[in-house]
């Protein structure tokens, strides 16, 4: 039943070109190249893509033509290694070109940069964008793919094609509208926010595969798909998990053509077999390919079958528990996870994986005991504290969020996390804490039954951002420990961290707290980031500062910015009042 078993093709590049079509082929090759060589100019990438495309066409015409039998990694790697400025631009990444496949591709993958030194994307005026769109639509859309791909080197490539399709639709519609800006800007904001979320979710999938292995990813997929498709049989879920794992392994490994092709096949299979998978797929399956795949990935959970029997009969009372565990460990644990997950759409995936791990640990111990059944009879009782911990945490934090609102809730988290891991860079602490704080508006509005899967699985995505950014420049053993010990226990590990008593406070630097009139022209979001950056720096200077002290300083700071932005001579106000504020803050915090 494997969806992906295909006949061997004489020419892999011809096969993928024919399967995907020229437009998707070119777009995916551009994404692949931009994700590997993140600093290369757009024009250079377009040139490389055109050369690869022309070559692919010769192979479509004659699969026996020279070099057409080479693997895609060989063809693409050879092409990337023709870039003249490789050594100057990328330094040691150029050494990858001395290696043979598959080591060369692995080398390129290792040099992907999650935080590339690229300028922030500034959105031009609407009229400027519309003119560029009308002048050369193809180049305009390629530029979008290029700019997103190079900034997000693990973006899920077939999903980026879907974003590009929506991007094009937004410009097609809005550039003809009476009020172009009113039409276009909300759509672009939505695409930007969804794109960041999509990138972060995919980054977690790739981290799961690359750092914790295929088994970890498959466990995650069994749990999530069982929640989503609770009426599907275990065999069906297992088959979908195997195929989904292949798709994500390919995309995370840079095999974007294979990934997109296999994702399309998987969507086709799911739609052809909806009756045995889920009743919620009908609408998705009526859509065109890119929309269909996206829709399936986001589809709501199906209703749980009525009268599911107690799990105890199969996994505690059964005579065959240890036999199954000994002879078919992963299948048996997979069945446990499937049965538990389909009954608990109200649990986060990471909680379900913790329960499965606890069950596994118990069987590991008990199946070697004198009386196994007596030993594991109470295993389900061990689940209670594991379930209650995230429930209580979410309850407390949602109460805090409702009391404070998003901005102040983010600030509370900024203080909390800076005290836990003060060695982490300020931009990373601000970015991660802001995202952690968004859990409030994202999840607290949900009823109890949907809060945990929303909140804890979202936090897993955000904490993975912290982990990948920290891995690039490791500064904290505590972060390394929480990030590497257990994928499913990352959030509890960070939650359990107390104030780092070993931290030596940062030297006070007045320059850090010097502000200028340019803050007045910033958007509300940018202004918040400036204030939150200052807050992190304050905590790094004075980690033992109380909430009340920090609140007083931040309130004074907000009043200072508001006052000076209203002043006639803003710059003078910032200079003079700024000095006073710094002195008052130092006094208030005892610096």
């Amino acid at each position: 039943r494997g969806v992906f078993r295909r006949d061997a093709h004489k020419s892999e590049v011809a096969h993928r070109f024919k399967d995907l079509g020229e437009e998707n082929f070119k777009a995916l090759v551009l994404i692949a190249f931009a994700q590997y060589l993140q600093q290369c100019p757009f024009e250079d990438h377009v040139k490389l893509v055109n050369e690869v495309t022309e070559f692919a066409k010769t192979c479509v015409a004659d699969e026996s033509a020279e070099n057409c039998d080479k693997s895609l990694h060989t063809l693409f790697g050879d092409k990337l290694c023709t870039v003249a400025t490789l050594r100057e631009t990328y330094g040691e990444m150029a050494d990858c070109c001395a290696k043979q496949e598959p080591e060369r591709n692995e080398c390129f993958l290792q040099h992907k940069d999650d935080n590339p030194n690229l300028p922030r994307l500034v959105r031009p005026e609407v009229d400027v964008m519309c003119t560029a769109f009308h002048d050369n639509e193809e180049t305009f859309l390629k530029k979008y793919l290029y700019e997103i791909a190079r900034r997000h080197p693990y973006f899920y490539a077939p999903e980026l094609l879907f974003f590009a399709k929506r991007y094009k639709a937004a410009f097609t519609e809005c550039c003809q509208a009476a009020d172009k800006a009113a039409c276009l800007l909300p759509k672009l904001d939505e695409l930007r926010d969804e794109g960041k979320a999509s990138s972060a979710k995919q980054r977690l999938k790739c981290a799961s595969l690359q750092k914790f292995g295929e088994r970890a990813f498959k466990a995650w997929a069994v749990a999530r798909l069982s929640q989503r498709f609770p009426k599907a049989e275990f065999a069906e879920v297992s088959k979908l998990v195997t195929d989904l794992t292949k798709v994500h392994t390919e995309c995370c490994h840079g095999d974007l053509l294979e990934c997109a092709d296999d994702r399309a096949d998987l969507a086709k299979y799911i739609c052809e077999n909806q009756d045995s998978i889920s009743s919620k797929l009908k609408e998705c399956c009526e859509k065109p390919l890119l929309e269909k795949s996206h829709c399936i990935a986001e589809v709501e959970n199906d209703e749980m079958p009525a009268d599911l029997p107690s799990l105890a009969a199969d996994f505690v009372e059964s005579k065959d528990v240890c036999k199954n565990y000994a002879e078919a460990k992963d299948v048996f644990l997979g069945m446990f996870l499937y049965e538990y997950a389909r009954r608990h759409p109200d649990y986060s995936v990471v909680l379900l994986l913790r329960l499965a791990k606890t069950y596994e640990t118990t069987l590991e111990k008990c199946c070697a005991a004198a009386d196994p059944h007596e030993c594991y009879a109470k295993v389900f009782d061990e689940f209670k504290p594991l379930v209650e911990e995230p429930q209580n945490l979410i309850k407390q934090n949602c109460e805090l969020f409702e009391q404070l609102g998003e901005y102040k809730f983010q600030n509370a988290l900024l203080v909390r996390y800076t005290k836990k891991v003060p060695q982490v860079s300020t931009p990373t602490l601000v970015e991660v804490s802001r995202n952690l704080g968004k859990v409030g508006s994202k999840c607290c509005k949900h009823p109890e039954a949907k809060r945990m899967p929303c909140a804890e699985d979202y936090l897993s995505v955000v904490l993975n951002q912290l982990c990948v950014l920290h891995e690039k420049t490791p500064v904290s053993d505590r972060v390394t420990k929480c990030c590497t010990e257990s994928l499913v226990n990352r959030r509890p590990c960070f939650s359990a961290l107390e104030v780092d008593e070993t931290y030596v406070p940062k030297e006070f630097n007045a320059e850090t707290f010097t502000f200028h009139a340019d803050i007045c022209t910033l958007s509300e979001k940018e202004r918040q980031i400036k204030k939150q950056t200052a807050l992190v720096e304050l905590v790094k200077h004075k980690p033992k500062a109380t909430k009340e002290q920090l609140k007083a300083v931040m309130d004074d700071f907000a009043a200072f910015v508001e006052k000076c932005c209203k002043a006639d001579d803003k710059e003078t106000c910032f200079a003079e009042e700024g000095k006073k504020l710094v002195a008052a803050s130092q006094a208030a915090l005892g610096l």
């Epitope: 275990f234 065999a235 996994f315 009372e317 005579k319």
Partner: nanobody, 126 residues
Framework: EVQLVESGGGLVQAGGSLRLSCAAS????????VAWFRQAPGKEREFTAG????????YYLDSVKGRFTISKDNTKNTVYLQMNSLKPEDTAVYYC???????????????????WGQGTQVTVSS
């Protein structure tokens, strides 16, 4: 929908042998565990033997271990129960049953099985 049809039952002397067959349609036995249950007059159905689907594991009632052997032929979509050294207490109606989509037997509780054959009578005379 899964259809199960048993055959191979009959009357046999103690110490003799029989081979029961369970032919499945609408479901491949290669991916689903299949169980044999038996029910003697006036008694409850009891799990007798089982075989994993896509996982090579066999399961037996303690009293039949060493005498009965369960096997399957994926090409014929059929599961067999080879019964040797039969005893009068093996007399019962033998049923084939499945819980769809499960590669393992995780419970011997008859109430948890969704699909059943019509049964085949086995009588062992002394």
């Amino acid at each position: 929908e899964v259809q199960l049809v048993e055959s191979g039952g009959g009357l046999v002397q103690a110490g003799g042998s029989l081979r029961l067959s369970c032919a499945a349609s609408g479901r491949t036995v290669s991916s689903t565990a299949v169980a044999w249950f038996r029910q003697a007059p006036g008694k409850e159905r009891e799990f007798t033997a089982g075989i994993g689907g896509s996982v090579d594991i066999t399961y037996y009632l303690d009293s039949v271990k060493g005498r009965f052997t369960i096997s399957k032929d994926n090409t014929k979509n059929t599961v067999y129960l080879q019964m040797n050294s039969l005893k009068p207490e093996d007399t019962a109606v033998y049923y084939c049953a499945v819980r769809p989509g499960r590669p393992l037997i995780t419970s011997r509780d008859a109430n948890l099985y969704d699909y059943w054959g019509q049964g085949t009578q086995v009588t062992v005379s002394s």
